[in-house]
């Protein structure tokens, strides 16, 4: 069964800066990755970035830099101020559309005990939805 992992980290240098890393543990070919916050994409969440392996990357504030880390993992740096600033309990979700497995989504947030600059190791998060 494919799995999606999500890792959220607050940067030590800027407390309003977050790094989200997501990966797909499956054998299929990834066709699209959608990163959202505030809940799953299409279920109350707001899209921050869309990454297509061949068409490129699109992102919207407060996303600052989205990129592919490998063929099956991505990272996104968020910077915010005021209303658009993420907070410590913000939920971030990553949805991977792949062939032939379909769509798999998982969410994560900053570990409660995290000091800035620290984060939990990237472990598979609970699968919220498989379309």
């Amino acid at each position: 069964t494919p799995e999606v992992w999500v890792q959220v980290r607050m940067e030590a240098t800027e407390l309003s800066s977050f790094t989200i890393r997501c990966g797909f543990l499956g054998s299929g070919s990834i066709s699209l990755v959608t990163v959202s916050w505030g809940g799953p994409n299409g279920a109350g969440g707001t899209t921050l970035a869309v990454l297509h392996p061949e068409r490129g990357i699109r992102q919207w504030a407060p996303a600052r830099q989205a990129r592919w880390e490998t063929q099956s993992s991505i990272s996104l740096i968020l910077e915010g101020s005021g209303a658009s600033s993420p907070c410590a309990n913000t939920t971030f979700c990553c949805k991977f559309a792949s062939f032939p497995e379909g769509s798999w989504e998982a969410c994560g947030s900053l570990p409660p005990s995290s000091d800035p600059g620290l984060s939990a190791p990237p472990t598979p998060a609970p699968i919220l939805r498989a379309d």
Partner: antibody
Framework: QVQLQQPGAELVKPGTSVKLSCKAS?????SYWINWVKLRPGQGLEW???????????NYNEKFKNKATLTVDTSSSTAYMQLTSLASEDSALYYC???????WGAGTTVTVSS | DIVMTQSPDSLSVSLGERATINCKSS????????????LAWYQQKPGQPPKLLIY???TRESGVPDRFTGSGSGTDFTLTISSLQAEDVAVYYC?????????FGQGTKLEIK
């Protein structure tokens, strides 16, 4: 099928503003971002910006940041681009295009003339 | 901004012959993470909006005839039409799909000789 509908033409006076529309159909409007592109004869295509209807958040090409304002009305599945302080160099064909530029509207010709 | 430069500006080719359009970007369009080139090609016929032909430098959009081929990597890309047809008369644009702002080349006008 996915369609983006734009009015054919707008004739406006120098110094005024115009609000162009792009009505989407055939898909969930809030899941697909809208780009705006300018075409002037002999000058090629220029990307003005994009907006994600799900979050109402735009990105702008710096060149157009003081010229264009992108908005959406999710209730009518329509994207808008307002152009201000119009001058002769704003006379052009303006296209909306969905997502990764894979679906295009037919374009609106804006003519700035007194 | 990434500057996209196409050559030639115009091209006249006989029916059935090969047409080649080049595109050079001022910065690499290669994504190091997944080793993909983010470059697209569009065809624009008179009175019509642009039509996506090629994305990812070499992947044909669904429904595009296989006489259209995209190639290249990094900063140098090529669109080749293997056997020119009358309906291929158009202006062709390359586009940086890599980073904001999404810049286009100045266009290459393709005509029948």
């Amino acid at each position: 099928q996915v369609q983006l509908q734009q009015p054919g033409a707008e004739l406006v006076k120098p110094g005024t503003s115009v609000k162009l529309s792009c009505k989407a159909s055939g898909y969930t409007f809030t899941s697909y971002w809208i780009n705006w592109v300018k075409l002037r004869p002999g000058q090629g295509l220029e990307w003005i910006g994009d907006i994600y209807p799900g979050s109402y958040i735009p990105n702008y090409n710096e060149k157009f940041k003081n010229k264009a304002t992108l908005t959406v009305d999710t209730s009518s599945s329509t994207a808008y681009m307002q152009l201000t302080s119009l001058a002769s160099e704003d006379s052009a064909l303006y296209y909306c295009a969905g997502g990764y530029f894979d679906v295009w509207g037919a374009g609106t010709t804006v003519t700035v003339s007194s | 901004d990434i500057v996209m430069t196409q050559s030639p500006d115009s091209l006249s080719v006989s029916l059935g012959e090969r047409a080649t359009i080049n595109c050079k970007s001022s910065q690499s369009l290669l994504s190091s993470g997944n080793q993909k080139n983010y470059l697209a090609w569009y065809q624009q016929k008179p009175g019509q909006p642009p039509k996506l032909l090629i994305y990812g430098a070499s992947t044909r959009e669904s429904g595009v005839p296989d006489r259209f081929t995209g190639s290249g990597s990094g900063t140098d890309f090529t669109l080749t039409i293997s056997s020119l047809q009358a309906e291929d008369v158009a202006v062709y644009y390359c586009q940086n799909d890599h980073s904001y702002p999404y810049t286009f080349g100045q266009g290459t006008k393709l005509e029948i000789k």
